[in-house]
């Protein structure tokens, strides 16, 4: 056969007996003969041994490139592959020769007293057991141990070849300490050598360090890094490693095999490196390598060594977070440090404890932002080793887009009396506050009841052209205050009014607030009615447990049966852009009320007595009239707001003061409260009363003590008293300096 | 750089000895695999041994098995082959080669070796 | 042990053409772990061969990605999209999914 390409086109090698295979006996001479075109060489079954005498190659006596080989008296090992082949080329010509020897059938291997066979586990490969026979035709069995088994050629799997040796799966033997072939010849056993099993694998599944990542120690201390190496079964491991100072005195490594699970097919190494009193020098990469053989597998990890314990702040702490009401806010600690530190959050000096709206750790987290969430949050970083603390401040400001208050609005269902004045009020309470609030308007019956529109008790108005009250043709006459700024319920509120000059035409009056993070709006229903007229006596919103009276004023030549109903509650506008129902085209969820009857020269008068206010009383009132001619249903309604009592409280510390001799002392004290407080001031728990030198204004809000003396130090204090109770606070002014003698100026207090 | 440098190789007759050097630089020698690859006359490339990093391990093509030995010195960075009753078909050129995830991903520039009488 | 066949034994291109070579085996290369154990080497005219692609289709470091492996569990393709005269040289596969790890006989690659 052929193998290889020579540069040269050459026939093969010619041998003096022209067959594949020749059986001779045993204690016969061999001699083949073999022809070329250039320089030949043999080789022979063992020729590797080099001590091999019988053989005898010679040169022909007739012609050049010719060789003959002989063999005296072969024996049964001198079966095997004869080749003449070019040297330098892998041109050769083959014969195999069997040398029948039936005292000894299988040919022996040069040296071994035994074989080895390797073999892996794997199902799909089979192994040959190299017992090689003198006889081609010979039955020959494979005998394992221990527990004994036997086996036989089956023609597919398992099979013997007297050339090549016998073939059988390699998982049949894996159990196998030894194996040997067995040939029977004329009821007489022979046995090949014996062959010893070992079962190989080599593949590393993978190799992990632990810890994998983020090593960090300090000079002095102990570090342990452990590699771990997965493998197929019957693998075995050796293990090294790499890292910056190799020759390390206290350096210690153990590697052992780990127990794995009976049925798993995986099997773990182990290597620990340990180096106790770790050194600056120690700081680098290390490397770990495990390797079976045929597979080396390295996995790194970074170890750094600190000096000593330190913590300190990442250059990419913030410093400021802003943020919308609703989001979720994540101010992260970064920090660098070793070893890792305490973190505490503190809000305006309070420290943050983690709960289900907020979580206080490497990060804080506040689930969903509101404004009470806005403020100075203090990190304070504190090494567990050393102790050291480092704080950093981030202010958080939550933005808060456009909330337009509903009892800041002229009711969304109120009536107006034709012909009147009319102001409408926008109270917008954002963050930032609105860079603009405008107002838009619409024909309500551009709005309402068009058949063409589905309309909705959520969305009853389907308006889509909006105009700008600028444009104020077909509508009431209008004109938009400048904005104004107010301190309403302890927030800063953008009130925007919008004056209608005379309430001619039912319009809807819509007004958009926007900020930089959102917009909201409120849609005002202002229904124009020349029917009754609606009053509250008396005229300001009543407070828990006050009367109030609603007046319904109608003309009798016009109207009659005047009836007081109170509005049901209705699903209250939730999205941007709703539009509240227009009440008088609604009268399902009217409840009828008891009313009195007054009569004067020209007007009816239904008055609806509300004795001790609650808060429930509070809500849309509609005063129903029918016209004495058409028969035509009119209604007015109007939106009664119970204030809730509040027991008074002081606003605003007051402060304890020095002061000297003939200057003058002003101070303030701001209650609030409903009903609104009473407010005395005392000195020296006596009541503090006004003369020419003590002056109370605004309610006896504000104190003020011109050209004070040394007399007038003291504890003064400040109440606010109402039914619901009292407040005080109370501040010491000391008054500094010596007494002028002087006529000019008798300064007589009463106290 | 890796480099790998094979020396020892030469004309030996059938059934003689020789043993191969592989010189390694340029990186960690004792965190690698090594292998013996060949590539015969014919140009055909056979893996014929392999050690593992600490030389513990090794593994033989089945066509040298018994006569091949492959070894290490990594306190010298250095691979050996050391070849024993050798054939006229163990001629060829010998590569030593650097082993990782069982890949030869770095080669010598090989030593030629013949078997002849 | 697993045999690996490869085609053509010679291959002639002209620079900046496309080729493939094939890489057929005996048996799957596919391993348990899902990964594809062949690899392709390159050996130019005088040196030693140097890894191009593993793990049937990762390129080696260096190897331009005008290289490209692809392949089933048997049939192999590697892909030199615009050969440059550097590519020349003999083009061998190996499996690694088997001991003894075997190669391929060589694809050559010359220019026309």
């Known amino acids: 056969a052929s193998v290889g390409l020579p540069s040269v086109s050459l026939d093969l090698p010619r041998l003096s007996i022209q067959k594949d295979i020749l059986t001779i006996k045993a204690n016969t001479t061999l001699q083949i003969t073999c022809r070329g075109q250039r320089d030949l060489d043999w080789l022979w079954p063992n020729n590797q041994s080099g001590s091999e005498q019988r053989v005898e190659v010679t040169e022909c006596s007739d012609g050049l490139f010719c060789k003959t080989l002989t063999i005296p008296k072969v024996i049964g090992n001198d079966t095997g592959a004869y080749k003449c082949f070019y040297r330098e080329t892998d041109l050769a010509s083959v014969i195999y020769v069997y040398v029948q020897d039936y005292r000894s059938p299988f040919i022996a291997s040069v040296s071994d007293q035994h074989g080895v066979v390797y073999i892996t586990e794997n199902k799909n490969k089979t192994v040959v057991i190299p017992c090689l026979g003198s006889i081609s035709n010979l039955n020959v069995s494979l005998c394992a141990r221990y527990p004994e088994k036997r086996f036989v050629p089956d023609g597919n799997r398992i099979s013997w070849d007297s050339k090549k040796g016998f073939t059988i799966p390699s998982y049949m033997i894996s159990y196998a300490g030894m194996v040997f072939c067995e040939a029977k010849i004329n009821d007489e056993s022979y046995q090949s050598i014996m062959y010893i099993v070992v079962v190989v694998g080599y593949r590393i599944y993978d190799v992990v360090l632990s810890p994998s990542h983020g090593i960090e120690l300090s000079v002095g201390e102990k570090l342990v890094l452990n590699c771990t190496a997965r493998t197929e079964l019957n693998v075995g491991i050796d293990f090294n490693w790499e890292y910056p100072s190799s020759k390390h005195q206290h350096k210690k490594l153990v590697n052992r095999d780990l127990k794995t699970q009976s049925g798993s097919e995986m099997k773990k190494f182990l290597s620990t490196l340990t180096i106790d009193g770790i050194t600056r020098s120690d700081q680098g990469l290390y490397t770990c390598a495990a390797s079976s053989g045929l597979m080396t597998k390295k996995n790194s990890t970074f170890v750094r060594v600190h000096e000593k314990p330190f913590v300190a702040f990442g250059s990419g702490m913030e410093s400021l977070v802003e943020a919308t009401v609703g989001e979720r806010v994540r101010i992260p600690a970064k920090y660098l440090g070793y070893p890792p530190p305490e973190i505490k959050w503190y809000k305006n000096g309070i420290p943050l404890e983690s709960n289900h709206t907020i979580k206080a750790g490497h990060v804080l987290t506040i689930m969903e932002v509101s404004e009470r969430d806005t403020g100075n949050y203090t990190v304070i970083l504190t090494n567990p080793i050393s102790k050291e603390k480092q704080s950093h401040v981030v202010s958080l400001v939550v933005y808060v887009p456009p909330q337009i208050g509903e009892k800041s609005l002229i009711s969304p269902v109120d009536s107006y009396q034709y012909g009147t004045t009319q102001t409408l009020t926008c109270t917008v309470y954002a963050i930032p506050p609105p860079h603009h609030i405008h107002w838009y308007w619409q024909l309500e019956e551009e709005c309402a009841n068009e058949p063409s529109h589905a309309v909705s008790v959520t969305n009853p108005y389907p308006c889509e052209e909006w105009r700008s009250v600028e444009d104020f043709q077909g509508g009431n006459k209008i004109e938009v205050n400048k904005n104004q700024f107010a301190l309403i319920e302890g927030k800063n509120k953008t009130v925007s009014t919008l004056v209608i000059q005379a309430a001619n035409v039912s319009a809807l009056y819509k007004c958009e607030a926007v900020n930089k993070v959102g917009r909201g709006e409120r849609v005002i229903s202002f229904h124009v009615t020349r029917g009754p007229e609606i009053t509250l006596q008396p005229d300001m919103q009543p407070t828990e447990q006050e009367s109030v009276s609603l007046w319904c004023t109608a003309d009798r030549s016009t109207f009659e049966n005047l009836t007081w109903y109170k509005l049901g509650p209705q699903p209250l506008p939730i999205h941007v852009g709703e539009l509240p129902t227009p009440v008088c085209k609604n009268l399902d969820t009217l409840w009828k009320l008891n009313a009195t009857m007054f009569s004067n020269s020209t007007n009816d008068i239904l008055i609806m007595e509300l004795k001790n206010a609650s808060l429930q009383d509070q809500g849309d009132y509609v005063c129903l009239a029918q016209d004495r001619k058409t028969k035509k249903r009119h209604c007015v309604v109007r939106q009664l707001t119970v204030l809730e009592r509040v027991a008074p409280t002081i606003t605003g510390n007051l402060e304890n003061q020095t002061t000297s001799i003939g200057e003058s002392i002003e101070v303030s004290c701001t209650a609030s409260g409903n009903p609104p407080p009473q407010i005395m001031w005392f000195k020296d728990n006596e009541t503090l009363v006004e003369d020419s030198g003590i002056v109370l204004k605004d309610g006896n809000r504000n104190l003020t003590i011109r050209r004070v003396r040394k007399e007038d130090e003291g504890l003064y204090t400040c109440q606010a008293c109402s039914v619901l109770g009292c407040a005080k606070v109370e501040a010491f002014f000391i008054i500094e300096g010596a007494q002028e003698k002087t006529n000019l100026e008798h300064h007589h207090h009463h106290h | 750089e890796v480099q790998l440098v094979e020396s020892g190789g030469g004309l030996v007759k059938p059934g003689g000895s020789l043993k191969l050097s592989c010189a390694a630089s340029g990186f960690t020698f004792s965190m690698y695999g090594m292998s013996w690859v060949r590539q015969t006359p014919g140009k055909r490339l056979e893996w014929v041994a392999s050690?593992?990093?600490?030389?513990?391990?090794?593994y033989y093509a089945d066509s040298v098995k018994g006569r091949f030995t492959i070894s290490r010195d990594n306190a010298k960075n250095t691979l050996y082959l050391q070849m024993n009753s050798l054939k006229a078909e163990d001629t060829a050129v010998y590569y030593c080669?650097?082993?990782?995830?069982?890949?030869?991903?770095?080669w010598g520039q090989g030593t030629t070796l013949t078997v002849s009488s | 042990d697993i045999v690996i066949t490869q085609t053509p034994l010679s291959l002639p291109v002209t620079p900046g053409e496309s080729v493939s070579i094939s890489c057929r085996s005996s048996?799957?290369?596919?391993?348990?772990?899902?990964?594809?154990?062949l690899n392709w080497f390159l050996q130019r005219p005088g040196q030693s061969p140097q890894l191009l692609i593993y793990?049937?289709?990762t390129r080696a470091s260096g190897v331009p990605d005008r290289f490209s492996g692809s392949g089933s569990g048997t049939d192999f393709t590697l892909k030199i999209s615009r050969v440059e005269a550097e590519d020349v040289g003999v083009y061998y596969c190996q499996q690694l999914v088997e001991y003894p790890f075997t190669f391929g006989s060589g694809t050559k690659l010359e220019i026309k």
């Open positions: 793990l049937m289709s």
């Open positions: 080669a650097r082993e990782l995830d069982g890949n030869y991903d770095y």
């Open positions: 050690i593992s990093i600490g030389g513990s391990y090794t």
């Open positions: 048996k799957s290369l596919l391993y348990k772990d899902g990964k594809t154990y």
